[in-house]
Amino acid sequence: DYKDDDDKGWVWNQFFVPEEMNTTSHHIGQLRSDLDNGNNSFQYKLLGAGAGSTFIIDERTGDIYAIQKLDREERSLYILRAQVIDIATGRAVEPESEFVIKVSDINDNEPRFLDEPYEAIVPEMSPEGTFVIKVTANDADDPSTGYHARILYNLERGQPYFSVEPTTGVIRISSKMDRELQDTYCVIIQAKDMLGQPGALSGTTTVSIKLSDINDNKPIFKESFYRFTISESAPIGTSIGKIMAYDDDIGENAEMEYSIEDDDSKIFDIIIDNDTQEGIVILKKKVDFEQQSYYGIRAKVKNCHVDEELAPAHVNASTTYIKVQVEDEDEPPVFLLPYYILEIPEGKPYGTIVGTVSATDPDRRQSPMRYYLTGSKMFDINDNGTIITTNMLDREVSAWYNLTVTATETYNVQQISSAHVYVQVFNINDNAPEFSQFYETYVCENAESGEIVQIISAIDRDESIEDHHFYFNHSLEDTNNSSFMLTDNQDNTAVILSNRTGFNLKEEPVFYMIILIADNGIPSLTSTNTLTIQVCDCGDSRNTETCANKGLLFIMGFRTEAIIAIMICVMVIFGFFFLILALKQRRKETLFPEKTEDFRENIFCYDDEGGGEEDSEAFDIVELRQSTVMRERKPQRSKSAEIRSLYRQSLQVGPDSAIFRKFILEKLEEANTDPCAPPFDSLQTFAYEGTGSSAGSLSSLASRDTDQEDDFDYLNDLGPRFKRLASMFGSAVQPNN
């Protein structure tokens, strides 16, 4: 119906458009202003959600068209606004007006089950009328339009066990079901709209109904009799065999427990395999064929969980008979004890009896034994099982011995048993005490009488029942050493005191003091020990801490100035050597282009003061140093080793300083004049030409620090191949050609 609105001048209506129209555009209605006289002066405008996309207006006539297929279920109402505009001015002729486009419903949606999949579980044997599940279908159509969304439910599949309430969708049981016959049911429910009238749309759903188990079956043994055998050697816990009972129920309702009956000695037990529900008969105690060779027992099975109301189904539990035959075995020897602890004092002569072990054959034939001993060569065993010593034992070497005695049957050597034998060696006082450490003792030249020079202590390798106690004495034989005196502190330490004021380093650089140390053992043992005391120039401070560093050089007779000079020389030599090395490495061109040299370079690091033998395994130094133009020399490496070994001896022995100084100076002179001696601790790179060269070595290693020159003029006579060498190493003045 057209509506005339006198205030606004609009002629319009509330528009309806059916959903799902298949035409490209569908005419809905017309907006018209009664001010429009058709004089091409008005323009109609459509505004709001859907304007210009879902709905289009003919701006000339006001005709509204739907240009898209509408779906009421997606959107059922459109609120739009209309304007009428004067084309000449571009202004609205009247106020904007709101109107409604309603999408009318058609029955285009079938009922749908939104909660799929439907799955229900109901106990087996449930009575008729038991609630199973409720299914609900939804219809997207308009419930206020006819019966578009009025649904009825119908059971398509599932009779005679189930039924559905037509209006609610509630599924109920209509007859009892046994899970052991069938455990799953597939029910199909149909939902129809329009109350099932012609033209109705329908949808279906499948309901999977599982029957849950109730414990309405008892377990029953598959067999009424089982026969098993067991070896008498089988250990406790051995599985003898499996028995099996079946229960038609599942899960917890099929869980069963087996029990043993008629087994007074409690030798057997049954455990259950939770995966297979089998009963495993196991050995609870050891069996002995010699004692009993046959056992007859009965096993019973019952469910673990039985509800009270289902108890009648479980009366008269199923039983089975089990016969166990014990098999005889040749058993290994058995020691009387699992292990033995024997004791013996140290120092006993070999052949001393330590103790006896014994093993027997448990079988009826009682085979004789043969014994073997392993674990130490200090012991032996005879056929009676008696263990004797084969050496004198020293507790300080080993206080315990862990031996293994093996017994074998003489009738069957394969039958072996072993036992551990622990031998404890008792202590006797057979070790004298000694200094607890090496003492590097110094006394200052300006020491005063009564000044503490050293505190000494002792150790004893013997074991003491009570604590060790040591007694210190100055040897009476040591008559020349009245310069020092010893005082026993009665606490296992003693103090060495200066017995005079002032010492002279040059006249008497070293003193040797003989000290006797006795222990409190029975019998008591005494040792003689020598303490070396070195005289040191401590300066005014009278502090001996720096003596250890200065000792050697001062003994040699060097003063501070000499030490500084030696250090500077060493640094200069090092600097010079590294400069040469750097220059050599920077040089790209080879010295002799005609023949490439074969260099073998070896770097050796000696972290110890002695040794140096490793280099002889890498290359032959003598071979490298050999030259027809040089006098034979001892290899420098061995010389330096000699010097080092003498240095080490000097710390311990301390020979006459003048002799030592003379020796060092000789060695320094020899090293200085040696043309093939590199600086000490330097990196040595040997360019070895090989034997047979009449020129000997041309290496820079062969150079000297003296003015002596080698004559290489003979290189001129070796022909054109040596022309370049001759020019480099020959005499400076060349003969005129």
Epitope: S25, N39, N40, S41, D58, E59, Y65, I67
Partner: antibody, heavy 122, light 108 residues
Framework: QVQLQESGPGLVKPSETLSLTCTVS????????WSWIRQPPGKGLEWIGY???????NYNPSLKSRVTISVDTSKNQFSLKLSSVTAADTALYYC????????????????WGQGTMVTVSS | DIVLTQSPGTLSLSPGERATLSCRAS???????LAWYQQKPGQAPRLLIS???SRATGIPDRFSGSGSGTDFTLTISRLEPEDFAVYYC?????????FGQGTRLEMK
């Protein structure tokens, strides 16, 4: 640029329906108004009616009872059907486009087809 | 319906001359919604002027339109040989759209 091409039978029997199609090329049929105009031999021009792409139509009252104009946006075409034709309907039929895009009212015809001659004769 | 009357029916002029074509409406044309077209033999009409005075795209400036209400004029300031054709006026101010009967411009 937009071009128009009329097509249809050149001869129609009296009392039958004249059917013509105008194909729009070089542009979209959407958002413009499309008209049919005819010109009898040796005479002036006569406006038949228009269609908007959404299907909205307006016809000349003198022909309204016999005229149907339709649109097929998917093919970019619009059509004319004139029923119960007589010899007076013999003319050169043109399709044309209003020059104003989505205009509020009518406008001059800025693009024309070449025209197709339809003769009504038995 | 608005009836449009064009005058003269035929106009004979020489190239270079000025041509004045008249169009009279039976009632006032709203918003000056009047257009002029040129049609040559065997061709479709061609839009010259819309809105009584606005030249269409590509139309030479020797063509001009004027008038309002009921009286409208098309003027060709200096005739060119290609300008000799039939000229129609059209109103689109009120439905239905109507055309004049046409003025034939011929070469003298």
């Amino acid at each position: 640029q937009v071009q128009l091409q009329e097509s249809g039978p050149g001869l129609v029997k009296p009392s039958e329906t004249l059917s013509l199609t105008c194909t729009v090329s070089g542009g979209s049929i959407n958002s413009y108004y499309w008209s049919w105009i005819r010109q009898p031999p040796g005479k002036g021009l006569e406006w038949i009616g228009y269609i908007y792409y959404i299907g909205s139509t307006n016809y000349n009252p003198s022909l309204k009872s016999r005229v149907t104009i339709s649109v097929d946006t998917s093919k970019n075409q619009f059509s004319l059907k004139l029923s119960s034709v007589t010899a007076a309907d013999t003319a050169l039929y043109y399709c044309a486009r209003d020059s104003r895009y989505r205009s509020g009212w009518y406008d001059a015809f800025d693009i024309w087809g070449q025209g197709t001659m339809v003769t009504v004769s038995s | 319906d608005i009836v449009l009357t064009q005058s003269p029916g035929t106009l004979s002029l020489s190239p270079g001359e000025r041509a004045t074509l008249s169009c009279r409406a039976s009632q006032s044309v709203a918003g000056s919604y009047l257009a002029w077209y040129q049609q040559k033999p065997g061709q479709a009409p061609r839009l010259l002027i819309s809105g009584a005075s606005s030249r269409a795209t590509g139309i030479p400036d020797r063509f001009s339109g004027s008038g309002s209400g009921t009286d409208f004029t098309l003027t060709i300031s200096r005739l060119e040989p290609e300008d000799f054709a039939v000229y129609y006026c059209q109103q689109y101010g009120k439905s239905p759209i109507t055309f004049g009967q046409g003025t034939r411009l011929e070469m003298k």
